[in-house]
């Protein structure tokens, strides 16, 4: 058993048929000695009396908020949560496996630049009685500070018969140098509590590996005289690290017809303009990627040819 | 520690070209190592990230763009630095700063070159003949060093008398390639910045 936060404790349980469970001794936080009674989860039924209460925790129903009282007055609370281990593996029932970039990916993170700011998100089908708390650091043995906000519900989607909920959190490394060469990864730890179930999820990454620039901005077309060609121009996204001559991007320009089956013409360039042939009903799209370190491409910025 | 905007130096352009070749070569070599040594811990997640130049050179700080010198986190990111005199930042001694930066890059290349050559000599003794260093990568390191045109003492190639442990050597190769790729990215950024200045 360990303390998650004040008055909240996690009981780690090996889960198998006929498991003996864990004996937990709760102590009422009071100088009083006599006349103390214990109840569970808002029920008035008395479970026992005395300054301590010993319980055998075997399953979820044995957890909950234990309260000690004296003469109708609440003295203290202890909320017990369960962390379930089956066949040596901690449960991962609360979050959905996103399977990208590999199996058992529960947390996904992205950064728009090298400032040390990043966003992580996760998915669940659970809609109620759910809380998350997020901690992060650079390195684990001698951790350096990363500050994370509160996790918030950022999207809801319908997937078949199920509703899926996306939560996200923003974190910022306390003292980040955009030009630094990372040797210690960022560690992100998410505590998830659903009803009386506790689970934790972790992700470890270098900012350089989770970079995904915003799409190029101010995408414009300039027709060239007496030609089907157009000059496409764009700018670096505002969120990208500066100076741009140091943090350079490379771009992919794509001409795509109305039908998805039509052949796509693609051009790669380090410049912020390109000359392409504009077909009728086609659209021109541009995306960006770090020029020197191949992490993710940005989403496309698009304009119609007409 | 910083790179103020300088008047274009025609000598920079070959360096930019060579640094791009370097990044391409080290990236290809790393990809080849990851594929060939698929049953060894050779991915970014599996290896320890070591920097053989740590406390010996200070490329990130010496080559910091002027725009980032206002960021205290960039100035404090390492104990060792070429510039301890703060007035250098204020006086904007461009050529002096650039010389420090480029000599730091040169020292990096020299250290990696020695490590890679020593390692290749060991790998050539491996009866499995599983992996060797790409001669193109070694050549590109040499070309960039020549383009940087610094004269410094030749570092003798490390020779070892004991029987090489090929498993350890291959893991060390992965560690070295990962670190060198990260340094090659920094070098490319620096050359691009200098080229644009």
């Amino acid at each position: 058993i360990w303390e998650l936060k004040k008055d909240v404790y996690v009981v780690e349980l090996d889960w198998y048929p006929d498991a003996p469970g864990e004996m937990v001794v709760l102590t009422c936080d009071t100088p009083e000695e006599d006349g103390i009674t214990w109840t569970l989860d808002q029920s008035s039924e008395v479970l026992g009396s005395g300054k301590t209460l010993t319980i055998q925790v075997k399953e979820f129903g044995d957890a909950g908020q234990y309260t000690c009282h004296k003469g109708g007055e609440v003295l203290s609370h202890s909320l017990l949560l369960l962390h379930k281990k089956e066949d040596g593996i901690w449960s991962t029932d609360i979050l959905k496996d996103q399977k990208e970039p590999k199996n058992k990916t529960f947390l996904r993170c992205e950064a728009k630049n090298y400032s040390g700011r990043f966003t992580c998100w996760w998915l669940t089908t659970i809609s109620t009685d759910l809380t998350f708390s997020v901690k992060s650091s650079r390195g684990s043995s001698d951790p350096q500070g990363v500050t994370c906000g509160a996790a918030t519900l950022s999207a809801e989607r319908v997937r078949g018969d199920n509703k899926e909920y996306e939560y996200s959190v923003e974190c910022q490394e306390d003292s980040a140098c955009p030009a630094a060469e990372e040797s210690l990864p960022i560690e992100v730890m998410v505590d998830a509590v659903h009803k009386l179930k506790y689970e934790n999820y972790t992700s470890s990454f270098f900012i350089r590996d989770i970079i995904k620039p915003d799409p190029p901005k101010n995408l414009q077309l300039k027709p060239l005289k007496n030609s089907r060609q157009v000059e496409v121009s764009w700018e670096y996204p505002d969120t990208w690290s500066t100076p741009h001559s140091y943090f350079s991007l490379t771009f992919c320009v794509q001409v795509q017809g109305k039908s998805k089956r039509e052949k796509k013409d693609r051009v790669f360039t380090d410049k912020t303009s390109a000359t392409v042939i504009c077909r009728k009903n086609a659209s021109i799209s541009v995306r960006a990627q770090d020029r020197y370190y191949s992490s993710s491409w940005s989403e496309w910025a698009s304009v119609p040819c007409s | 520690r910083n790179l103020p905007v300088a008047t274009p130096d025609p000598g920079m352009f070959p360096c930019l070209h060579h640094s791009q070749n370097l990044l391409r070569a080290v990236s290809n070599m790393l990809q080849k190592a990851r594929q060939t040594l698929e049953f060894y811990p050779c991915t970014s997640e599996e290896i320890d990230h070591e920097d053989i130049t740590k406390d010996k050179t200070s490329t990130v700080e010496a080559c910091l763009p002027l725009e980032l010198t206002k960021n205290e986190s960039c100035l404090n990111s390492r104990e060792t630095s070429f510039i301890t005199n703060g007035s250098c930042l204020a006086s904007r001694k461009t050529s002096f700063m650039m010389a420090l930066c480029l000599s730091s890059i040169y020292e990096d290349l020299k250290m990696y070159q020695v490590e890679f050559k020593t390692m290749n000599a060991k790998l050539l003794m491996d009866p499995k003949r599983q992996i060797f260093l790409d001669q193109n990568m070694l050549a590109v390191i040499d070309e960039l060093m020549q383009a940087l045109n610094f004269n410094s003492e030749t570092v003798p190639q490390k020779s070892s008398l004991e029987e090489p442990d090929f498993y350890k050597t291959k893991i060390k190769l992965c560690i070295l390639l990962h670190a060198f790729r990260i340094r090659a990215v920094t070098i490319d950024r620096v050359m691009s910045y200098l080229n644009a200045s």
């Epitope: 469970g21 569970l40 989860d41 808002q42 039924e45 925790v57 129903g61 044995d62 009803k195 | -």
Partner: nanobody, 124 residues
Framework: QVQLVESGGGLVQAGGSLRLSCAAS????????MGWFRQVPGKEREFVAV????????YYPDSVKGRFTISKDSAKNTVYLQMNNLKPEDTAVYYC?????????????????WGQGTQVTVSS
């Protein structure tokens, strides 16, 4: 999902005893409490006994206290209701139920899963 199957109901004389069993299957580890409720035609379902978890707490209404005992065999995922000193007013359909809710474990409206029910008739 949790599936519940009751057994052990029947006809018994007043003052007699019966033991009801409820076998649970499926995602039983999600359940917080299991209980027995009864219903007489035309009346609301009534709480009879609830066991919380593996037995940290048991709840009974005054009408059955001292006569009925709820217990659980966690290994077999089975809940039992031992009914002694039965009275004609105990005649009803007895339902086994399971809840994933922490609170109001004596309120049948908070229960997620129900068995099909077993008839208990007490003759005088």
């Amino acid at each position: 999902q949790v599936q519940l199957v009751e057994s052990g109901g029947g006809l018994v004389q007043a003052g007699g005893s019966l033991r009801l069993s409820c076998a649970a299957s499926g995602r039983t580890f999600e359940t917080i409490a299991m209980g027995w409720f009864r219903q007489v035609p035309g009346k609301e379902r009534e709480f009879v006994a609830v066991i919380r978890g593996s037995g940290v707490a048991t709840y009974y209404p005054d009408s059955v206290k001292g006569r009925f005992t709820i217990s659980k065999d966690s290994a077999k995922n089975t809940v039992y209701l031992q009914m002694n000193n039965l009275k004609p007013e105990d005649t009803a359909v007895y339902y086994c139920a399971a809840t994933t809710n922490r609170f109001k474990n004596t309120d049948y409206t908070t229960y997620d899963y129900w068995g099909q029910g077993t008839q208990v008739t007490v003759s005088s």
